[in-house]
């Protein structure tokens, strides 16, 4: 049960909602968008002032942290039984500090099991925010502080910060460090989409969100 | 597999400009940026500044802000430096190098051969 | 600026020696440091990256190590063509750095 179920139900007001796992009686909170492109979006994630540390360990990303109505990490392993029920999309949105706003869709998304390191696949990228994909593709294994699974002989997520499908490490990042205004340039560790905003910028808010590709 | 190639040696006089070029080859020149690091006869290593070969984005040592001006042709890879109000203090090896920008990665390889850039009157 | 303090200026020592190079940063780099060797009329070479990744095709003498303020990079077991001069570098901010660079001899 998803946001997309809810807001089939008759639930058509953005907010925190009550998920529960694919075949499962088990519970998660999350934050529904029912406004945005038709709305039924499950946020997994969202970034906009740095109230909350994202540089977590592997079983935090695996269950989630945060608050659902403000920053947060909805869970690997609640998005990686989701998308492995049906085809879900990925949207990506993005915000930087001078009051432009980009995305990039992904028409096929899912994560693989833990077992396989929640690795994440993709495919079919458009919108406005870099016609090449900044999530390496092929898709990488999610790495922690204290789960080291990237391809780089360094350790990405303890350079970079925070949890990641790091490649070498790869130009992305939106769990990377919160720089407020005025201190978002130069920044090595920061939130970054470098196919829309280049090295060293880090951004203002990022949001993703799912949704099933037959909504 | 990948080259900097960098254009030849420059006898300037002091009050000139010169552009040192360096033309790569051999990976995806969006994913990478360069710094640009010079050398004086028997001293050691001081950056000049860096340029980003995706979007153009610079960042120029203070010491060298209004002097010095970094440029990228994607059509042809190439980077270029230009160095204005040329001081004999400016004579020295300048290397191009190259960095993995797209991972925020600003360690140097490869770097070019140097191009010697000598200012006397 | 973060500056970078590398001792000593230069070293003289006999093959098979044991060589540490030091270097200090006037403020914390997490692992964002890398070495160069140079030897006298080409360009620098990278040797290692992350404070102790080794550079594909560097010598397994080599290697690195620190996080923070302090690094070193230690070569075991010198061998004649490791004479030359090597630079650290903080990779951690604009503008980026150098240490003043350690003369390596050949006794």
């Known amino acids: 049960r998803d946001c997309a179920e809810v807001f089939k139900s008759g639930h058509t007001t953005n907010g925190i909602y009550t998920l529960t796992f694919p075949n499962s009686t088990e519970e998660i909170k999350a934050y529904c968008d029912m406004e945005a492109g038709g709305g039924g979006w499950t946020i997994i994630q969202r970034r906009e002032d740095g109230s909350v540390d994202f540089q977590r360990t592997w079983k935090e990303y695996k269950v989630g942290f945060g608050n659902p109505s403000g920053e947060y990490w909805l869970g690997n392993e609640f998005v990686s039984q989701l998308t492995n029920q049906q085809r879900y999309v990925l949207k990506i949105h993005l915000k930087d500090w001078e009051g432009n706003e980009a995305y990039s869709l992904y028409e096929h998304f899912y994560l693989s099991s833990e077992e396989l390191n929640y690795r994440i696949h993709l495919k079919g990228l458009t919108g406005t925010a870099g016609k090449i994909s900044s999530i390496s593709q092929p898709g990488n294994d999610f790495s922690t502080k204290d789960g080291d699974n990237d391809k780089c002989m360094c350790k990405c997520s303890q350079m970079l910060t925070g949890g990641w499908w790091f490649d070498a490490c790869g130009p992305s990042n939106l769990n990377g460090m919160y720089y407020p205004q005025r201190q978002n340039t130069n920044k090595f560790n920061g939130i970054k989409w470098y196919y829309w905003k280049g090295s060293g910028y880090s951004l203002k808010a990022t949001t993703m969100m799912i949704r099933p590709a037959d909504f | 597999q990948v080259q900097l190639v960098q254009s030849g040696v420059e006898v300037k006089k002091p009050g000139a400009s010169v552009k040192v070029s360096c033309k790569t080859s051999?990976?995806?020149?969006?994913?990478?940026?360069f710094s640009w690091v010079r050398q004086a006869p028997g001293q050691g290593l001081e950056w000049l500044g860096w340029i980003s070969g995706y979007n153009g984005n610079t960042n120029y040592a203070q010491k060298f802000q209004g002097r010095v001006t970094m440029t990228t042709d994607t059509s042809t890879s190439t980077a270029y430096m230009e160095l204005r109000t040329l001081r004999s203090d400016d004579t020295a090896v300048y290397y191009c190098?190259?960095?993995?920008?797209?991972?925020?990665?600003?360690?140097?390889?490869?770097w070019g051969q140097g191009t010697l850039v000598t200012v006397a009157s | 600026d973060i500056q970078m303090t590398q001792s000593p200026s230069s070293v003289s020592a006999s093959v098979g020696d044991r060589v540490i190079i030091t270097c200090r940063a006037s403020?914390?780099?997490?692992?964002?440091l890398a070495w160069y060797q140079q030897k006298p009329g080409t360009a620098p070479k990278l040797l290692i990256h992350s404070a102790s990744s080794l550079q594909t095709g560097v010598p397994s003498r080599f290697s690195g190590s620190g996080s923070g303020t302090e690094f070193a990079l230690t070569i075991n077991s010198l061998q004649p063509e490791d004479f030359g001069t090597y630079y650290c570098q903080q990779a951690n901010s604009f503008p980026l750095t150098f240490g003043g660079g350690t003369r390596v001899e050949i006794k």
């Open positions: 403020q914390g780099l997490s692992s964002w």
């Open positions: 051999g990976y995806t020149f969006s994913n990478n940026g």
């Open positions: 190098a190259r960095d993995q920008d797209y991972s925020n990665f600003h360690w140097l390889d490869p």
